[in-house]
Interface confidence: low
């Protein structure tokens, strides 16, 4: 064979990724690989991920002789072991006056009365626990409820008989029911007074209120 066809193991170097070639015989060589590479020609990047430090669902991303952890949103740090304070990152995490409480791997909301849900955005249905008298209509409010009474019933829970049903107020007086006790209240027209607006007024006082 001609001299131009002589095989020189390290010319050119078969070692890749920065590996250094060393001739070990007439037709043999050895590659000294840089950290992070392996194989007869340093062609393989060693996978640093099988035994890594990424925790709490962190995903390992292999590098050259190193790795990085890609952490889920609620964790941070080199190995995803540090809790993210969502309450600092999201000042409005809790709605409707709820208080944010940071927890390992997440956060929770402590809701004010009348609100519920993960972010306190759900108005609690107070009617579910209300004791409006059957036949009345419950109206849900924030942290409270009110009862709409059918005709003939009165009181906060519509549990009282409406004293105005018997028309106790005379002479065109207005009859209202006291929501606490169900008793009637007469608002007398000009010139009349008394619990039932049956008495004449000597002086010119108008709109007397009488409770009974």
């Amino acid at each position: 064979a001609g001299s131009d066809s002589l095989y020189v193991p390290c010319a050119p170097s078969p070692c890749v990724n920065g590996g250094t070639c060393r001739q070990t015989g007439d037709f043999t060589f050895e590659c000294n690989c840089l950290p992070g590479f392996e194989g007869s020609t340093c062609e393989r990047n060693i996978d640093d991920c099988p035994n890594h430090r990424c925790q709490n669902g962190g995903v390992c991303v292999d590098g050259v002789n190193t790795y990085n952890c890609r952490c889920p949103p609620q964790w941070t740090g080199q190995f995803c072991t540090e809790d993210v304070d969502e309450c600092l990152l999201q000042p409005n995490a809790c709605q409707n006056g709820g208080t944010c409480a940071n927890r390992n791997g997440g956060y929770g909301c402590v809701c004010v009365n009348g609100w519920s849900g993960d972010d306190c955005s759900e108005n609690i249905d107070d009617c579910a626990f209300a004791s409006c008298t059957p036949g009345s209509t419950c109206i849900d409010r924030v942290a409270s409820f009110s009862c709409m009474c059918p005709e003939g019933k009165a009181g906060l829970l519509c549990h009282l008989d409406d004293a105005c049903i018997s028309n106790p107020c005379h002479k065109g007086a207005l009859c209202d029911t006291n929501p606490l006790n169900g008793q009637y209240i007469c608002t007398c027209p000009q010139g009349y007074k008394g619990a039932d607006c049956t008495e004449d007024v000597d002086e010119g006082n108008s709109h007397h209120h009488h409770h009974h």
């Epitope: 099988p50 890594h52 190193t66 740090g77 080199q78 072991t81």
Partner: antibody, heavy 117, light 112 residues
Framework: EVQLVQSGAEVKKPGASVKVSCKAS????????IHWVRQAPGQGPEWTGY????????KFNEKFKGRATSTVDTSSTTAYMELSRLRSDDTVVYYC??????????WGQGTLVTVSS | DIVMTQSPDSLAVSLGERATINCRSS???????????LHWYQQKPGQPPKLLIY???NRFSGVPDRFSGSGSGTDFTLTISSLQAEDVAVYYC?????????FGGGTKVEIK
Amino acid sequence: EVQLVQSGAEVKKPGASVKVSCKASGYTFSNYVIHWVRQAPGQGPEWTGYIIPGSGGTKFNEKFKGRATSTVDTSSTTAYMELSRLRSDDTVVYYCARDGAGSFTYWGQGTLVTVSS
Amino acid sequence: DIVMTQSPDSLAVSLGERATINCRSSQSLVHSDGNTYLHWYQQKPGQPPKLLIYRISNRFSGVPDRFSGSGSGTDFTLTISSLQAEDVAVYYCLQSTHFPDTFGGGTKVEIK
């Protein structure tokens, strides 16, 4: 309260093996790497290796590869490290330590291993 | 491996005076995630090391505020602003940016 409690002192002959235990409590065992750090008398600490309790995956300092192994028993939240083919320069205190902040946040009290013929 | 060089080897400081310990790494400790994993430990005789400062300057829980850390890249400092009797110990720096984690040789702090 996070606690790491290690097994007691050991005296071994050269060529023998030693197995040190580290019982963890006060936190979610599978969430944190357990490291092994050794310290020769009058010297600075030296990181030996770690184990990930959730997967059993281990990684060791090149210096101890082939001689050191680590295992966990998740039911008892205990980590173990075994070092074989002991030599006189393996006369050190072995510590277990919990990972956190990319550091070693909580430590066991240490286990003295004496290698002597 | 990354070599961590501490200076001085020992330090004698009067009670109430400032103590400063230096730590230099053989290459930058800035991790690709942007953090610098340089930590400081205190060790008293017969006890395990105790974490004082993590990631350059963050005091670990229960550590008095007379301990502070600073630095960047390859040069870092632990400062005890007013030395107390209970601060007599050996102090170590640790890097965990690069595999394997490596400690400094230690600085012994004594009372003058």
